[in-house]
Amino acid sequence: IWELKKDVYVVELDWYPDAPGEMVVLTCDTPEEDGITWTLDQSSEVLGSGKTLTIQVKEFGDAGQYTCHKGGEVLSHSLLLLHKKEDGIWSTDILKDQKEPKNKTFLRCEAKNYSGRFTCWWLTTISTDLTFSVKSSRGSSDPQGVTCGAATLSAERVRGDNKEYEYSVECQEDSACPAAEESLPIEVMVDAVHKLKYENYTSSFFIRDIIKPDPPKNLQLKPLKNSRQVEVSWEYPDTWSTPHSYFSLTFCVQVQGKSKREKKDRVFTDKTSATVICRKNASISVRAQDRYYSSSWSEWASVPCS
Amino acid sequence: RAVPGGSSPAWTQCQQLSQKLCTLAWSAHPLVGHMDLREEGDEETTNDVPHIQCGDGCDPQGLRDNSQFCLQRIHQGLIFYEKLLGSDIFTGEPSLLPDSPVGQLHASLLGLSQLLQPEGHHWETQQIPSLSPSQPWQRLLLRFKILRSLQAFVAVAARVFAHGAATLSP
């Protein structure tokens, strides 16, 4: 058993049929010595008396808020949560496996630049009685500070018969060094509590590996005289690291109709302009990627050809 | 050229060669991004590699103030990786294809280090750790880790030279 926060404790249980469970001793936070009784949740049934209560925790029915009283007055609470371990593996019932970029990916994180700011998100089908708390650091043995905000519900989607909820959190490395080569990864730890179930999820990454620039901005077309060719130009996204002579991007320019199966023109360039062939009912799209490190491409920025 | 006395390197040549290094480092091991090598106990293998750290003056302001500190750091790293790529880790079994990008990568690391430090000038170089994996699978894992680390190192070096070519070239 360990303390998650004040008066909230996590009991780690091996979860299998007829498992013996864990013996837990609760101590009432009071100077009083006698006349103390214990109850669980809203029940008035007295579970025991005395300053300590010894219980055998085997299942969710044994978890909950234990309260010690004296003469009708509440002295203190202890909330017991369960953390299940099945076949040596901690349960992951609360969050959905996003399966990208690999199986058992529960947390996904992205950064728009090298400033040390990043966003992580996760998915669940659970709508109520759900809380998250996020901690992060750079490195684990001698951790350097990363400050994370509160996790918030950022999107709701309908998937078949189910509703899916996306939560996200923003974090900022306290003393980021955008130009340095990272040697220690960022660690992100998410504590998830659903009713009386506790689970924790972690992710470890370098900012350079989660970079995904915003799409290029200010796409403009200039038709070339006596030609079907157009010059398309764009700018670096505002959110990208500066100076651009140092933090350079490379670009993919594509002309395509509405369907992916339609014919297309495509060219890669390090410049912020390119010459392409425009077709009626087609769009010109541009996306960006770090020029020197193969992290994710941005989403496309598009303008119609006409 | 970035001689220890402090004259300027051939920024544009260094830029071209460092960008080539980036391409080669990813060609040598493009799939490395899909392997989570941090699960494999990274500490003892890649903590010894020289990293371009915050105080090394490789940021735009540091380069403007005095590029020598940064160039010396990059030179150290190039020599270090050049030695690693020429070591038993890469020459031993399982043997690499004769025309694998690792060969070109090795040559290009040497080429860039020579651009930074002509013959007769000597910056101190970091000792190469004695990593001699006994099993082929250990060697393979170590290659992945070294190339992964090299990808990060040459990305920073390429940014330095691109910025230098754009803003510090005479």
């Epitope: 079907r228 060719q229 490379t250 199966r261 339609e262 014919k263 297309k264 023109d265 495509r266 060219v267 890669f268 360039t269 390090d270 010459t275 062939i277 077709r279 009626k280 | 060609s27 493009p30």
Partner: antibody, heavy 118, light 107 residues
Amino acid sequence: EVQLQQSGADLVRSGASIKLSCTASGFNIKDYYMHWVKQRPEQGLEWIGWIDPENGDTEYAPKFQGKATMTADTSSNTAYLQLSSLTSEDTAVYYCNAHKELRYFDVWGAGTTVTVSS
Amino acid sequence: DIVLTQSPATLSVTPGDSVSLSCRASQSISINLHWYQQKSHESPRLLIKFASQSISGIPSRFSGYGSGTDFTLSINSVETEDFGRYFCQQSNSWPLTFGAGTKLELK
């Protein structure tokens, strides 16, 4: 199966014109760009130009402007290359090519050998 | 026009050898470079697109890399069916241009 059937070899007199054909099967040429590429005996490849059969748009390499004319007939699913004022320099194999991507070449015809005699 | 220089002009190899063919552009072309194989009396065939992207149906022994001005096509363990000419082609700017080719022949 996506295929391009090119017209047969031809021997033509210097100064004459010739029209080569390239008929597609297994796909509709309207959905593809059609390119023509020249290869002289024991030499490299030269791009002549492309046509978008959907709208008749064409783009030629400067070297072939005035020498080559590309057309397409979507009803017969065929692209054509006309070469005019032929000289010995035009003796070559001419390949047609179809691809959904404009700038490189995927499906190649078997080529038509054109020999210009003086 | 962008000029592509291929080297060597001829490469004599034994089946089982691994080889690298080079293509150099007269100016930077990012990764807008493609490789083709042409066997004797046949049409060219696309092997690699955009410097390093593989093409379905092409054996995995063919790989490409490079960007900017220097590009390489590697054949890992040449097979007898690989003999022929190899061309690179740039798609960075019009007109599209090809290299003069490298002839891969039996030693």
